[in-house]
């Protein structure tokens, strides 16, 4: 048995920097408690964007600083990042893991390339 | 750098306790679950026991399980294993590792070796 | 629990010759979670491949993963003589976390 994580490949952000994803896993078995991380791969250094722990049935809680949201229904989670900019343009990976009941799952996506593209600076106006 | 570093190892009689620590430095402790891994001499390497983040959630082998435990201290960046009811087949070197980002274990202590002899 | 078994148990080689390492596992390795580790005599294990074909950072070309299912080989294309060391490979995407019980690449 083995979790399967599925994420759209490619995502434009809109004009304010944001940019929304569906992470989709394949459950092997009946998880209560599921922890979601987005990691960031630009070359080949990885780094934690966010991080969140939720029980299932409830609300993805980040901390209060993290620039994600989320929202879970079943075995998907809606991902939203805010504030990006066009340097953020990257790979953006998700992680799923199970973390109770046992056994222990880990599960991680072949990553959503974001675009970000920075908004023009509107013309000055006589 | 990152940095794991094991303490807490000795002799110790069968049936008696020890606990081992493992001090991390040089990344953000609380972001990462760890495990204990362990070596017997002359032997493979064998998986022990994992935490989670928080340490909310403890996974242990069917050889340690009910003698065991592993904890995690955040606050001082300081990983535990709780060794009771030892046995001579628990002897080995003990290391602590983290758990990269993509799931392997990539970094490790230099371990602390056990022996439980009488 | 996956059981992870390594052959051969020991790889007689000369410097500068190529080394193949075989870990099979007794089920499906999900999505490639396979990592390899080195370990030489008195110090810790070191991750050389992780996701059956990723090289850790700092590991040089000459090593290289393949394979994905249940058979993964660990390749050296050209053996250096800080090379020569005990080899494992590990499945890391369920618990019980399991290792193969090594492979010791020694001078010929």
């Known amino acids: 048995k083995a979790m399967h994580v599925a994420q759209p490949a490619v995502v434009l952000a809109n004009s304010r920097g944001t940019a929304s994803f569906v992470c989709e896993y394949a459950s092997p078995g009946k998880a209560t408690e599921v922890r979601v991380t987005v990691l960031r791969q630009a070359d080949s250094q990885v780094t934690e964007v966010c991080a969140a722990t939720y029980m299932m049935g409830n609300e993805l809680t980040f901390l209060d600083d993290s620039i994600c949201t989320g929202t879970s229904s079943g075995n998907q989670v809606n991902l939203t990042i805010q504030g990006l900019r066009a340097m953020d343009t990257g790979l953006y990976i998700c992680k799923v893991e199970l973390m109770y009941p046992p056994p222990y799952y880990m599960g991680i996506g072949n990553g959503t390339q974001i675009y970000v593209i920075d908004p023009e600076p509107c013309p000055d106006s006589d | 750098q990152v940095q794991l570093v094991e303490s807490g190892g000795g002799v110790v009689q069968p049936g008696r306790s020890l606990r081992l620590s493992c001090a991390a430095s040089?990344?953000?402790?609380?972001?990462?679950?760890m495990h204990w891994v362990r070596q017997a001499p002359g032997k493979g390497l064998e998986w022990v026991t994992f935490?989670?983040?928080?340490?909310?959630?403890?996974y242990y082998a069917d050889s340690v399980k009910g003698r065991f435990t592993i904890s995690r201290d955040n606050s001082k960046n300081t990983l535990y294993l709780q060794m009771n009811s030892l046995r001579a087949e628990d002897t080995a070197i003990y290391y602590c590792?983290?758990?990269?980002?993509?799931?392997?274990?990539?970094?490790w202590g230099q371990g602390t070796l056990v022996t439980v002899s009488s | 629990e996956i059981v992870l078994t390594q052959s051969p148990g020991t790889l007689s080689l000369s410097p500068g010759e190529r080394a193949t390492l075989s870990c099979r596992a007794s089920?499906?390795?999900?999505?490639?979670?396979l990592a390899w580790y080195q370990q030489k005599p008195g110090q810790a294990p070191r991750l050389l491949i992780y996701?059956?074909?990723s090289r850790a950072t700092g590991i040089p070309d000459r090593f290289s993963g393949s394979g994905s299912g249940t058979d993964f080989t660990l390749t050296i294309s050209r053996l250096e003589p800080e090379d020569f060391a005990v080899y494992y490979c590990?499945?890391?995407?369920?618990?019980?976390?399991?290792f193969g019980q090594g492979t010791k690449v020694e001078i010929k």
């Open positions: 040089g990344f953000t402790f609380s972001h990462y679950t």
């Open positions: 996701g059956a074909f």
């Open positions: 590990q499945q890391y995407g369920s618990s019980p976390w399991t």
């Open positions: 935490i989670s983040y928080d340490g909310n959630n403890k």
């Open positions: 590792a983290r758990t990269g980002w993509l799931g392997p274990f990539d970094y």
């Open positions: 089920q499906e390795v999900g999505d490639s979670y």
